[in-house]
């Protein structure tokens, strides 16, 4: 394993780690955010950062309700310096092979390089090549959206079905949902699960004459995707007189594997490529985002890329003290490793962002769910938070109870857009939504002590049940509006937060060996399900389950 990017094995070896341990013991664990606000009238001013996007729109990141003070922030920044986060960041942006276990560059940032500055991987300036694919996406999406691209009977395309899984599904699903306001010409559907129900239910609502299938698979060998793709192809052929020449107008591939695409029967002119330096969970910026471009239009897709590019510029050019994603990542490390927090809640106060937590779940947990460092040793500290979330205010009526009064510390990010795309009832809904956004963060911070509970009339044994400890940390993210540029910026923010965490933990955030073992065993078991014999080759539990399944199937 190539570990030329970091010169330490474990984060616990770094002097700033020990320093933070001492600070945590002496002041961190007893720090009261409420008191910090009383002590420092400029706390909000100091601890909120405003990001200005390429189009002039703004996003405010308020870190002031976190369990930090000036000394803690300074020590965290010292940790970032000692871990050489900026060195690893710069190596990533230079196209170096920072994915050491797979010996690959990590270059999703090159996909949103709309300034078209030279960006090199292995001596190749990939900027013109990225631009070439985007030009293809632009031309194709405009042809389909305008009706110039027609199905085999001459009808225009009305529905797009994206067949993919993981990174080839989650990103496009989340983005098309988040930017639904910008759609209108086409309907998009997403099929990911190998469960036949997913493809069957989708095929019920589309017409073969007017449907375009996008087969999204980096390798074009992903079992779930290719099985679903073959089912779609068989369905299409059965409805269209079994004429394979019709496939060209109704199937496109988003892949790196031209040979497999051709074997499947898709014209390679309808293949939209990307490179091995694009990880699945970072691929929505690539040809994998074609469903997004088709749905919201290419110009909006480009604005989405530019929003991310603006965060990339901020991340690479801003001093550490004001570097928004870096601070977000440092706070995560602070809670994870010093407070023992194991989770990270992301609650968007925005129905359009209802899939955002699921998307971030893959981004964060597949990236940082690792226990071996770049130095090839097991960590002696916690990594990878369990990220979860649901849109608020729904979340307030489910798991917020535990966030407010449970036994676990759950650092939380709340996200709100000041301007709604649907300001109905004279903005009544938006004002109610916003009031909850502000109130929840305030409530988690200030809590409610025994005195207040009693003053409100509670007595006896009921009193402790109504007490809120408060001092529960939140980061409030307030955007002006959820536009393509804003969404691009928010995703890139979390990408670089994830990067910062991984750099400090000294883990490779860009491989995913953990997904392999289950896949291998599933292949073995798949063969066993094809015959009627009783299975005894596994442990008693697995054997028992397989045999019961076979009996009931």
């Amino acid at each position: 394993s190539n570990n030329s990017f970091t010169n330490f094995k474990l984060a616990t070896e770094l002097p700033a780690w020990s320093k933070l341990q001492k600070i945590y013991e002496s002041q961190g664990k007893t720090l009261s955010v409420k008191q910090e606000f009383q002590k420092d009238a400029k706390r909000f001013e100091k601890l909120n950062k405003t990001f200005t996007n390429y189009d002039g729109s703004k996003i405010l990141f308020d870190y002031s309700k976190n369990l930090v003070n000036d000394e803690i922030i300074a020590a965290l920044i010292e940790l970032a310096k000692e871990a050489n986060v900026t060195g690893l960041r710069d190596a990533m942006f230079k196209g170096e092979h920072i994915n050491s276990t797979e010996d690959r560059a990590v270059y999703h940032v090159a996909l949103r390089n709309r300034a078209n500055k030279p960006m090199y991987v292995d001596g190749v300036n990939v900027a013109p090549e990225v631009d070439s694919v985007l030009k293809h996406m632009k031309e194709f999406s405009e042809q389909v959206r305008s009706g110039e691209w027609k199905g085999y009977t001459g009808k225009k395309i009305t529905d797009v079905v994206n067949i993919g899984i993981g990174g080839s599904d989650l990103g496009p699903v989340m983005v098309t949902e988040a930017l639904k306001h910008y759609a209108g010409v086409l309907d998009v559907h997403f099929v990911s699960n190998i469960d036949g129900t997913h493809i069957a239910e989708t095929l019920k609502v589309v017409d073969p004459e007017t449907t375009l299938f996008l087969i999204a698979s980096k390798t074009f060998t992903t079992a779930e995707t290719i099985t679903n793709a073959n089912t779609a192809k068989n369905w299409f052929l059965s409805k269209t007189g079994n004429d394979p020449s019709h496939i060209a107008k109704h199937f496109a591939a988003l892949s790196t594997n031209e040979t497999e695409v051709a074997k499947f029967g898709i014209d390679t002119k309808n293949m939209f490529g990307f490179e091995s330096w694009v990880g699945g969970r970072y691929s929505v910026w690539s040809a994998i985002g074609l469903s997004v471009a088709l749905y919201i239009g290419y110009d909006n897709f480009e604005a989405f890329l530019k929003g991310a590019e603006a965060v990339d510029n901020h991340f690479t050019q801003t001093p550490l003290e004001d570097n928004i994603p870096l601070l977000g990542g440092l706070l995560s490390v602070w809670y994870n490793n010093f407070f023992g927090a194991q989770t990270h809640l992301v609650a968007p106060f925005d129905q359009y962002l209802h899939r955002f937590p699921a998307y971030l779940q893959q981004l964060s947990m597949e990236s940082n769910g690792k226990s071996v460092t770049r130095g090839n040793v097991f960590t002696d500290y916690s990594t990878g938070s369990i990220l979860f979330g649901e849109p608020a205010t729904n979340a307030q009526h489910s798991f917020f109870q535990l966030v407010h009064q449970g036994t676990k510390l759950i650092p939380s990010d709340f996200i709100l857009a000041a301007q709604s795309h649907n300001p109905i009832e004279n903005k009544l809904h938006q004002k109610m939504l916003a009031s909850n956004f502000f109130a929840q963060a305030e409530a988690l911070m200030v809590g409610k002590d025994e005195e207040q509970v009693k003053a409100e009339g509670a007595t006896g044994g009921l009193v402790p049940h109504k007490v809120f400890s408060g001092n529960r940390p939140t980061t409030s993210i307030l955007a002006q509006k959820i536009t393509p540029a804003t969404l691009g910026a928010l995703i890139a923010y979390y990408e670089h937060v994830t990067f910062t965490e991984g750099a400090i933990w000294n883990i490779n955030s860009f491989d995913q060996w953990g997904v392999e073992l289950g896949k291998v065993l599933a292949k073995v078991i798949g063969k066993e399900l094809d015959n009627s014999s009783t299975i005894s080759t596994h442990d008693a539990s697995t054997n028992g389950l397989i045999n019961q399944f076979k009996e009931w199937m």
Partner: nanobody
């Protein structure tokens, strides 16, 4: 800096063979459809043969079918044109052409190599 460098041209007798090579640098070679074009004196440049990025499909101009074979070695960033049963009318400057995904949005030309078929 993108470069396509052809080699292998020369003088050959009718019925003879030549193997042209074109080595690319500064590109993600396996993503480029590669072609050979030729231009005879006083004539238009014409397409001779094309191969897709992974080599999964090839196409030939009618007059060279069965005589010429295009192939590629992506590990060496090189495309070849094996020319057999050469005829005087094959005399031309042969150019290597790289087209990103074969879509025409990003393409590069080599300098050309002279092939002369004469007795």
């Amino acid at each position: 800096q993108v470069q396509l460098v052809e080699s292998g041209g020369g003088l050959v007798q009718p019925g003879g063979s030549l193997r042209l090579s074109c080595t690319a640098s500064g590109v993600t070679f396996s993503r480029y459809a590669m072609s050979w074009y030729r231009q005879a004196p006083g004539k238009e440049r014409e397409l001779v043969a094309t191969i897709t990025g992974a080599g999964s499909s090839t196409n030939y101009e009618d007059s060279v079918k069965g005589r010429f074979t295009i192939s590629r070695d992506n590990a060496k960033n090189t495309v070849y044109l094996q020319m057999n049963s050469l005829k005087p009318e094959d005399t031309a400057v042969y150019y290597c052409y790289a087209d990103h995904y074969g879509l025409g949005y990003l393409d590069y030309w080599g300098q050309g190599t002279q092939v002369t078929v004469s007795s």
